[in-house]
Interface confidence: low
């Protein structure tokens, strides 16, 4: 209840997160024209990426373009990119949709299609659908520890969500353990009324809200966080508006003294931690 006699002040907060969990990924691997099942283990270093601010990212799906090298090659024949002669290709042109700089030549992409030749990381990335089901769908069972330190400078009061008395093997539950700050990712989605398996395919943005409603009067002191969850990206966006959440990154290596890279289009969940609240004192 609002205590009108109290002097209220907004919370100042810092957040630190740690994600834990291991995923086993099974995918088709093509080597020398032979496709076989490949198994790999993903740990925290493989699926999480440092983000600025109060956010962390967990990769749940990916598309790889392996063995790319900087050279000349035909660009991917996306819609509107095909050509029949060199006139369609403009030397030095950088089409924002393309992956490189055009050389001015129209060259065969495959037996039936021709596209403009580009100077780029080749072969250029194909426009592939995100695998379904998601490759790291087991990320549902990963956990994240959220450390939240808060401060009310006007009241000279500091606290944190983690107390020394808390049990390190707990898992957050809104009824049974609402003060535990280790969250199972699947539970976060369930609480928000979302299907993790579905969102994991294209990615998305999930908000973790930490609300501090602090009464700092010594006779009725209370200052503990309340957690709630909601999806922040627009899940109903039309396909043409690029649904979900993804970005690209590359792993570089040398082969026979030639620099190569594996390009990875990573789909996943960006978790934004939103801390708000007030501290009141007489």
């Amino acid at each position: 209840s609002d205590k009108l006699y109290q002097r209220k002040e907004p919370v100042i907060s810092s957040v630190h997160t740690k994600v834990k969990g291991i995923a086993e990924v099974t995918e088709n691997v093509t080597e020398g024209g032979v496709t076989k099942l490949g198994h790999s283990i993903f740990d925290t270093a493989d699926y999480t990426f440092p983000l600025q601010g109060n956010s962390f990212f967990v990769m749940t799906n990916y598309v790889k373009s392996e063995g790319q090298v900087q050279t000349l090659c035909p660009e991917y024949p996306r819609r509107g990119a095909q050509c029949s002669s060199d006139r369609r290709c403009k030397k030095g042109w950088m089409d924002p949709q393309s992956k490189g700089i055009q050389t001015g030549r129209c060259v065969p992409y495959d037996k039936t299609r021709k596209t403009c030749e580009v100077s780029a990381w080749c072969p250029t990335e194909e426009e592939k659908e995100a695998p379904r089901p998601a490759l790291l769908r087991s990320a549902e069972n990963f956990t994240v520890l959220i450390k939240n330190n808060i401060h009310f400078p006007g009241h000279n009061y500091t606290t944190r969500n983690i107390l020394p008395t808390m049990n390190g093997s707990c898992t957050f539950h809104k009824t049974w353990d609402p003060q535990c700050s280790i969250f199972r990712l699947g539970d976060i989605f369930q609480e928000a009324g979302e299907n993790f398996t579905e969102v994991a395919v294209q990615g998305g943005i999930m908000g973790i809200e930490i609300y501090w409603d602090c009464n700092l009067d010594s006779w009725s002191h209370h200052c503990r966080p309340r957690y709630s969850f909601r999806r922040l990206d627009d899940k109903n966006t039309d396909e043409s508006f690029v649904p979900g959440y993804n970005f690209r990154y590359a792993k570089y290596y040398k082969e026979n003294n030639v620099e190569k890279r594996t390009l990875i289009k990573a789909f996943g969940i960006r978790f934004d931690i939103l801390v708000f609240g007030t501290g009141g004192k007489f």
Partner: nanobody, 123 residues
Framework: EVQLVESGGGLVQAGGSLRVSCAAS???????MGWFRQAPGKEREFVST????????VYADSVKGRFTISRDNAKDTVYLQMNSLKPEDTAVYYC?????????????????WGQGTQVTVSS
């Protein structure tokens, strides 16, 4: 990368004392440090922790009044003085370090771990 090395473990009679040390390979003055232990067939459990400046200490109920945690930041070393030892204190004692400066009883909170030192209390 911080390496933690425990020493000082051994065999002692019930009622006796022992001091275990934890030396860090790098500067840990801004870290909180903790001790955990694991008895045979049991899960690793919290023993004690100390904040970066030594101002805050926390002890498990089972060791309160008998064990004392301390640190020497100039030597990047943490100590656990164990008095009035009991047979149930028998375990491998692990030193742990957290880059956060405040104390925590959570294993989840500690980034760096030592290999452990065996403490055996005979009756």
């Amino acid at each position: 990368e911080v390496q933690l090395v425990e020493s000082g473990g051994g065999l002692v009679q019930a009622g006796g004392s022992l001091r275990v040390s934890c030396a860090a390979s790098a500067r840990t003055g801004s870290y909180s440090m903790g001790w955990f232990r694991q008895a045979p067939g049991k899960e690793r459990e919290f023993v004690s922790t100390i904040s970066w400046n030594g101002a805050d200490t926390v002890y498990a109920d089972s060791v309160k009044g008998r064990f004392t945690i301390s640190r020497d930041n100039a030597k990047d070393t943490v100590y656990l003085q164990m008095n009035s030892l009991k047979p149930e204190d028998t375990a491998v004692y692990y030193c742990a370090g957290s880059i956060t400066s405040y104390v925590s009883t959570w294993q989840h909170d500690y980034e760096y771990w030592g290999q452990g030192t065996q403490v055996t209390v005979s009756s």
